[in-house]
Interface confidence: low
Amino acid sequence: KESTPDVQGQFPCDFSWGVTESVLKPESVASSPQFSDPHLYVWNATGNRLLHRVEGVRLKTRPAQCTDFVNIKKQLEMLARMKVTHYRFALDWASVLPTGNLSAVNRQALRYYRCVVSEGLKLGISAMVTLYYPTHAHLGLPEPLLHADGWLNPSTAEAFQAYAGLCFQELGDLVKLWITINEPNRLSDIYNRSGNDTYGAAHNLLVAHALAWRLYDRQFRPSQRGAVSLSLHADWAEPANPYADSHWRAAERFLQFEIAWFAEPLFKTGDYPAAMREYIASKHRRGLSSSALPRLTEAERRLLKGTVDFCALNHFTTRFVMHEQLAGSRYDSDRDIQFLQDITRLSSPTRLAVIPWGVRKLLRWVRRNYGDMDIYITASGIDDQALEDDRLRKYYLGKYLQEVLKAYLIDKVRIKGYYAFKLAEEKSKPRFGFFTSDFKAKSSIQFYNKVISSRGFPFENSSSRCSQTQENTECTVCLFLVQKKPL
């Protein structure tokens, strides 16, 4: 059955209640230079409009503080109102390493990110940090790597490993949950000139992730005791016509091309899904596509296999799919899939269908295919036009969390966290935020607060209290380090 009655029950005490933000652009300088500059200035407002130092006058200074960054104050105010236990945000690789290698490290950017993490910890909010978050408009790569063919160039994977190592070294004492790459399975939207470009870029992204995981596993895990994975875009697929076999096959094929493409090599075999490889090969043989999945060497399979500590899924909606034979040598046509927009379904302004039961089906599919592992939903949300009373978002959150709870209570899926997407919206973008672009709170915040404080949807008389030891204590030493380690 698709929809089942709501359940009453609670998530475990160590469940991560999170909110996700995309790339945080680091502020280059703290907003309060007067605290570190002992000189007094007067502003020549009517003349040359410059600041002129007053000679012979020295002011008391104080060390720079994290809260001198205006952005951080804003972030913290929003996070405090969200009452979350975890905050997922992404670093800007291009800001941290403008040259793409370790020859020019932007220490100020790293200090900014360290401040975001450490100030969050003071509020009891742990960070899940994403190292690389490409967006469709912008690849987010350092300029030199972009000009050297980006992810089509295998050396970008080596550069990523060095960047990851730097971040683990600089932030790993405070950060215990890492995402290497956000939605590498959606980079097909950018590397779409040909299927071979798409599969080649994907291969290099897989290698980049695995190199970073291996580096962490050996060099940093013994002392930092953290966990590393990558976030896959993981929408569920249903046959548009449940009575058509070809539609069922198309739905499974969608999941193979979308999720298994990355999950199979990392979680299971070290190689691409046989179903995907065979489907592309059969189209190749029939002259319908010249695409081919890369052949992996034994060393590459060794490198990829098992390089995840947990499963991280970004789930937004369910797609209704049907089979349609498509000619052409691109990833989209290799799949032979057509999407159907079901106008009878509740949908968002950007046509995202609200299909709560899809997330439960997804979680069961992942467990069935990849075993009983810890799963985090690292982004889940909907766009809602309302600037104050965002009812669609409240409905979405309530219903999707209900299905996640069913997966936990009934299906015994090891779900460890849910990260709502996203903290604040950006100007002229679909409205996914809990806060407007000018930081005004929406009413869905109170709804999410209530779910968090209740740990789900408890029975009337059940306690939502957790003892200190049961709560999410993944970073007990972090607060100590925040105080002791210079920022």
């Epitope: 370790l102 695995a210 580096l215 050996r218 034994e298 060794r302 098992g306």
Partner: antibody, heavy 120, light 111 residues
Amino acid sequence: QVQLQQSGPELVKPGALVKISCKASGYTFTRYDINWVKKRPGQGLEWIGWIYPGDDSTKYNEKFKGKATLTADKSSSTAYMQLSSLTSENSAVYFCARSDYYGSRSFVYWGQGTLVTVSA
Amino acid sequence: DILLTQSPASLAVSLGQRATISCRASKSVSTSGYSYMHWYQQKPGQPPKLLIYLASNLESGVPARFSGRGSGTDFTLNIHPVEEEDAATYYCHHSGELPYTFGGGTKLEIK
């Protein structure tokens, strides 16, 4: 916790062969290399080679090719080293040690060592 | 093969003082920003114990009096202040390329 348990001491005759074992526990056996290291009295440590139990691939120090053969049994999480055509030069303590090929490749976990004595 | 030359072959250090052991590689063991040089301590009848990995990283559970530094071809292990239990043989080990090799060892005696 991670443990590597090696087989007991061996007294063997020149020209014979010996097979020593290293049983791993506390981690996923197929995910990490098992290295073998030789230590002779009054001398330093020598790396013999590694086996990756995930696919049974091996790498040897040229000096030990033909002398040492590394194998692994996934079902029992045990790695083996066979030494053939033994001479007094092969009398030593042999250690197994775990490393991660794509990490730093240092050896964190070691077996207790197996003493092999070659004597007529 | 990369030859690792350790010096001195032996040294005696008073309790509480500093012990410095150096290791020189016949060619660089540094690549992609990491130096694949490690240090081990071995006591009689025991397997070696990893102290420092990747030139300067302290292995979990190892006292902070052990430290490592260096890159390229020259590396040092420092122990300060030396304690009674530090009497042992110390080896450097590179894993930059195959075959991996070890230094000849330095025997540390406590006066």
